[in-house]
């Protein structure tokens, strides 16, 4: 008896091949004798069946001797043996159908888990394969489970499910909902505007929720709500913002944020959270702020930062064209009785500069200069 | 081109039997179906059934059963449609006409009618 | 049985007018629909097969929409020698089926 496996909401067409080359009558029942569908001269006639209003045949074939079985928006209860009866015999085929669902939802916050459960006839026992986007594959039975989801796993993930050797292929479009990036860092000099961006890894048409931005500045004790806002179809409404410092964000996606300058009492780290309609859990972003400020005093030049910076950063104060007088791992330099000229404060890893302040050191007979 | 041409009108008595025809040029006639539709004023057109000149099959609707027989002559590419015992209420135009190659496209092509009165 | 049900059963209508007949099945019949045009003595032309194709030779004027139970022919700008009787005839499922017709006069 042929096997032919079937989609859940798919089309099937079981094939019914007469030797004559013509048409001639046909009969499609199922395993209760139960007649679905058949022809009477020319026409197509239908039985009593379950099948009645998603059964058909291409009539196109007939004078061919090919008397097909259309099986429209395929029901797990389908699966059944059908009978074809042509020229005094008959051709059975098993048609098996199969369903693959995502658990709730296939839109899933970054880190939460995906379930695939399989739809089988009774009797059945199929395997499962999938393969995630990044290409990872995962086995199973009836469920498979995959626990933490990163950013990668969006995408079209592909389900083999084999029964009776044959196979038959889901696709399943998983939407993992995260920002663009976990964490980001922001360089800049004291007095300079910040633009904090955080662009959404998805899209989708209706985007509704709710979010707000904690900020821990280096020399604060707390952390505290920088500012709260709405997202309603795409559309950005400030609800709450602190007065100091007064934030300004942007009306449209993606999520944008500008403070009006970069001051060393701002320095420091904020969470962006975001929590979407309909779903459990939310959204978290990182955002740092370092801030560098170059001053003379008296004899003194000296350049800080503040911030959240790696040990592994260099904070370097050199005249300009000419080697670094100081370079350091710490987030404060300085240079007693500096040369008069141009003076670079360089903040860089591994000799790439991520932040630059000059300063112009007059003659000492004169006050500094900052550009 | 494609072309039915149908026998003329007949006079009958009620009780008696007639038998139509209708006569196929343009294409093979034993490829195609014959279907045969009756037509009444105020009763719009039924389908009396159809013919595959090629294997002589048959199929009739339920309510000419026994009343329409049909046969084709293949040799004369003719299709022929008897009535029996005729009544009053067989009284119409009969008209034959093409199925569709695939069974795609109905009934496409027409003859003119044969007319069709039993009166005694 | 598969009925046809066509309306309007009569319709007057200008010249250059657009005119829509409708014809609704008691089930879905897969866009098995034929439209017909007859003239008072003569025998029906096929104007529309399979809901929405147009036969060779037939003006362009004429078209054919619909699909499960709801299907319309329509006649973009209505000419003198459109005046007559249209049906529709379903041949999704054995017997096929005729409209009760529409007659198209001229006002």
């Known amino acids: 008896k042929k096997v032919v496996l079937g989609k859940k909401g798919d089309t099937v067409e079981l094939t019914c091949t007469a030797s004559q080359k013509k048409s001639i009558q046909f009969h499609w029942k199922n395993s209760n004798q139960i007649k679905i569908l058949g022809n009477q001269g020319s026409f197509l006639t239908k039985g009593p069946s379950k099948l009645n209003d998603r059964a058909d045949s291409r009539r196109s074939l007939w004078d061919q001797g090919n008397f097909p079985l259309i099986i429209k928006n395929l029901k797990i209860e389908d699966s059944d043996t059908y009978i074809c009866e042509v020229e005094d015999q008959k051709e059975e085929v098993q048609l098996l159908v199969f369903g693959l669902t995502a658990n709730s939802d296939t839109h899933l916050l970054q880190g939460q888990s995906l379930t695939l459960t399989l739809e089988s006839p009774p009797g059945s026992s199929p395997s499962v394969q999938c393969r995630s986007p990044r290409g990872k594959n995962i086995q199973g039975g009836k469920t498979l489970s995959v626990s933490q989801l990163e950013l990668q796993d969006s995408g079209t993930w592909t389900c083999t499910v084999l029964q009776n050797q044959k196979k038959v292929e889901f696709k399943i479009d998983i939407v993992v909902l995260a920002f663009q990036k976990a964490s980001s860092i922001v360089y800049k000099k004291e007095g300079e505007q910040v633009e904090f961006s955080f662009p959404l890894a998805f899209t989708v048409e209706k985007l509704t929720g709710s979010g707000e931005l904690w900020w821990q500045a280096e020399r604060a004790s707390s952390s505290k709500s920088w500012i709260t806002f709405d997202l309603k179809n795409k559309e950005v409404s400030v609800k709450r913002v602190t007065q100091d410092p007064k934030l300004q964000m942007g009306k449209k996606l993606p999520l944008h944020l500008t403070l009006p300058q970069a001051l060393p009492q701002y320095a420091g780290s904020g969470n962006l959270t975001l929590a979407l309609e309909a779903k459990t859990g939310k959204l978290h972003q990182e955002v740092n702020l370092v801030v560098m400020r170059a001053t003379q005093l008296q004899k003194n030049l000296t350049c800080e930062v503040w911030g959240p910076t790696s040990p592994k950063l260099m904070l370097s104060l050199k005249l300009e064209n000419k080697e670094a007088k100081v370079s350091k791992r710490e987030k404060a330099v300085w240079v007693l009785n500096p040369e008069a000229g141009m003076w670079q404060c360089l903040l860089s890893d591994s000799g790439q500069v991520l932040l630059e302040s000059n300063i112009k050191v007059l003659p000492t007979w004169s006050t500094p200069v900052q550009p | 081109q494609v072309q039915l041409q149908q026998s003329g009108a007949e006079l009958m008595k009620p009780g008696a039997s007639v038998k139509m025809s209708c006569k196929a040029t343009?294409?093979?006639?034993?490829?195609?179906?014959i279907e045969w539709v009756k037509q009444r004023p105020g009763h719009g057109l039924e389908w009396i059934g159809e013919i595959l000149p090629g294997s002589g099959s048959t199929s009739y609707n339920e309510k000419f059963k026994g009343k329409a027989t049909f046969t084709a002559d293949t040799s004369s590419s003719t299709a022929y449609m008897q009535l029996s015992s005729l009544t009053s209420e067989d009284s119409a135009v009969y008209y034959c006409a093409r199925r569709g190659y695939g069974y795609d496209e109905g009934f496409d092509y027409w003859g003119q009618g044969s007319t069709l009165t039993v009166s005694s | 049985d598969i009925k046809m049900t066509q309306s309007p059963s009569s319709m007057y209508a200008s010249l250059g007018e657009r005119v829509t007949i409708t014809c609704k099945a008691s089930q879905d019949i897969n866009s098995y629909l034929s439209w017909f045009q007859q003239k008072p003595g003569k025998s029906p032309k096929t104007l529309i097969y399979r809901a929405n194709r147009l036969v060779d030779g037939v003006p362009s004027r004429f078209s054919g929409s619909g699909s499960g139970q709801d299907y319309s022919l329509t006649i973009s700008s209505l000419e003198y020698e459109d005046m007559g009787i249209y049906y529709c005839l379903q041949y999704d499922e054995f017997p096929p089926t005729f409209g009760a017709g529409t007659k198209l006069e001229l006002k």
């Open positions: 343009g294409y093979t006639f034993s490829n195609y179906w």
